[in-house]
């Protein structure tokens, strides 16, 4: 059994935050959409991912992880630039593969410190050790030497596009984990909402049976699907209100009459 | 239906090692969808996580810092079963020791548990 | 290490009567898409722990329709809609969102 080193960050542990902001508590805000969001967390000093509501919330909220640790790491870009350099890599690289405890599928990246390189691996959704990066490009960053890596990958963001539901035609990621995608249309014109309203229901890659509901912009409802419990996308709500109130507000019905609430 | 049953000393000598088995039956030490834990209970420190291995594509194991030079889990693939053994042990040690299961596909939790040990650790 | 705070710690209970118990984490516990890394157990006198319910608002199988979960961030609650008697017993919430797993100091749920 091989013994893992810690996951402690000693370089950064002792610092304070560069504003006062980042000692908030996380705040997903009264709204119930399910925008993937990052904050920094006073009591392990790290950027970590939560849920933001989609309204109110606070300042310690940022859409990348990268935006978050530039903002409340102190010398975090000086640190990224040495280790990327060659000079100093944080011991994390340098922990073995752990696809954690639980057994979703995510795609992630780590570095492999034998062949130099950050490679993909799957993780499972839980635990697992912090050579785990959520994209190859921040990988490269904090573990390679940025003067041999090729241009970052682009990742398909699936919030600027909706599925017409035929059939396969590639894979790419949502929210770092591998499905299968479909034909890319235009959003519709008559929806002015949330764009993740739009995407289907899609019921993940684990084997729960958990009920949940997504809003069909077809028919303007929330509908009940089977969630399996890891992975899927944002158009996933535990209640038919949640879903109604989050999604039902931004179909148009006709250019005279405006939002149906 | 999974079932844990746990078996070793209740009492234990201190500085000395203390030595508990788990038997499976229901599953298998080397499944990929479960993870294989100790857990100790008792009155000052309430449940108290020590530590767990699981198999994917290779072992790994995780320990609790507070025992991480002391502690070793080890499974056996030919009994379908995993042990425990926590050396230099004191009387702060003594406790209600469980093994469990964490299920890893569906449940994400320690959805079994065995019976129970209480180790005393006194000379 | 994440600490979770239970209130109260002792709870005394009518049948047929609610219960609610809360948990709070020291840190907020990462969930995605509503799941959340925050489990419910019970352990009833003389028995080990059981699962009640997993990520937060699932109830494990064979678990009664009267116990739900909910909760965000670092603030969790388990609910008992009409307590039995046979529902007495220390209820422990647990994270798994880092490394070590931890759990809180128990909630002690008996009849009045």
């Known amino acids: 059994l091989s013994e893992e080193a810690d996951d402690t960050d000693s370089e950064l542990g002792s610092m304070k935050p560069l504003h006062t902001f980042c000692a908030m508590k996380a705040d997903d805000g009264p709204c119930k959409a399910m925008i993937r969001s990052y904050f920094f967390n006073m009591y392990t000093h790290q950027c970590e991912e939560f849920i933001y509501g989609g309204c109110e919330g606070n300042e310690n909220r940022f859409d990348t992880l990268e935006e978050c640790k530039k903002t409340c790491i102190p010398g975090y870009e000086k640190t990224a630039v040495k280790a990327a350099s060659g000079a100093e890599r944080p011991d994390f690289c340098f922990l073995e593969e752990d696809p954690g405890l639980c057994r979703g599928y995510m795609k992630r990246y780590l570095y492999n410190n034998q062949t130099k390189q950050c490679e993909r691996f799957v993780y499972g959704g839980c635990l697992g050790n912090r050579n785990n990066f959520e994209t190859l490009d921040e990988c490269k960053k904090i573990c390679e030497n940025p003067v041999h890596s090729p241009s970052p990958v682009n990742e398909v963001q699936m919030s600027d596009y909706v599925t017409d539901g035929n059939t396969v035609t590639d894979r790419s990621t949502v929210n770092n984990i591998v499905v299968p995608q479909s034909p890319k249309v235009p959003r519709r014109r008559d929806y002015r909402g949330r764009p993740w309203c739009l995407q289907p229901a899609d019921s993940g890659l684990c084997k729960a049976s958990e009920r949940r509901f997504y809003y069909n912009s077809a028919t303007g409802k929330c509908h009940r699907f089977n969630y399996t419990g890891c992975g899927g996308n944002n158009n996933n709500f535990t209640t038919r209100r949640r879903c109604l109130r989050s999604c039902k507000t931004g179909l148009i019905k006709n250019k005279s009459k405006g939002v149906v609430k | 239906q999974v079932q844990l049953q746990q078996s070793g000393p209740g009492l234990v000598k201190p500085s000395q090692t203390l030595s508990l088995t788990c038997a499976i039956s229901?599953?298998?030490?080397?499944?990929?969808?479960?993870?294989w834990s100790w857990i100790r209970q008792s009155p000052g420190r309430g449940l108290e996580w020590l530590g767990i291995i699981y198999k994917r594509s290779k072992w790994y194991n995780r320990y609790a810092v507070s025992v991480k030079s002391r502690i070793t889990i080890n499974p056996d693939t030919s009994k379908n079963q995993f042990s425990l053994q926590l050396n230099s042990v004191t009387p702060e040690d003594t406790a209600v020791y469980y093994c469990?299961?964490?299920?890893?596909?569906?449940?994400?939790?320690?959805?079994?548990w065995g019976q129970g040990t209480l180790v005393t650790v006194s000379s | 290490d994440i600490v979770m705070t239970q209130s109260p710690l002792s709870l005394p209970v009518t049948p047929g009567e609610p219960a609610s118990i809360s948990c709070r984490s020291s840190?907020?516990?990462?969930?995605?898409?509503?799941?959340?890394?925050l489990n419910w157990y019970l352990q009833k006198p003389g028995q080990s722990p059981q699962l009640l319910i997993y990520?937060?608002?699932n109830r494990a199988s064979g678990v009664p329709d009267r116990f739900s979960g909910s909760g965000s961030g670092t603030d969790f609650t388990l609910k008992i809609s009409r307590v039995e008697a046979e529902d007495v017993g220390v209820y422990y919430c647990q994270q798994y969102d880092s490394y070590p797993l931890t759990f809180g100091q128990g909630t002690k749920v008996e009849i009045k």
């Open positions: 840190q907020s516990l990462v969930f995605r898409f509503g799941t959340t890394y």
């Open positions: 469990a299961r964490w299920h890893s596909d569906k449940m994400w939790g320690f959805d079994d």
């Open positions: 229901g599953d298998s030490v080397s499944s990929d969808s479960a993870a």
């Open positions: 990520k937060g608002s």
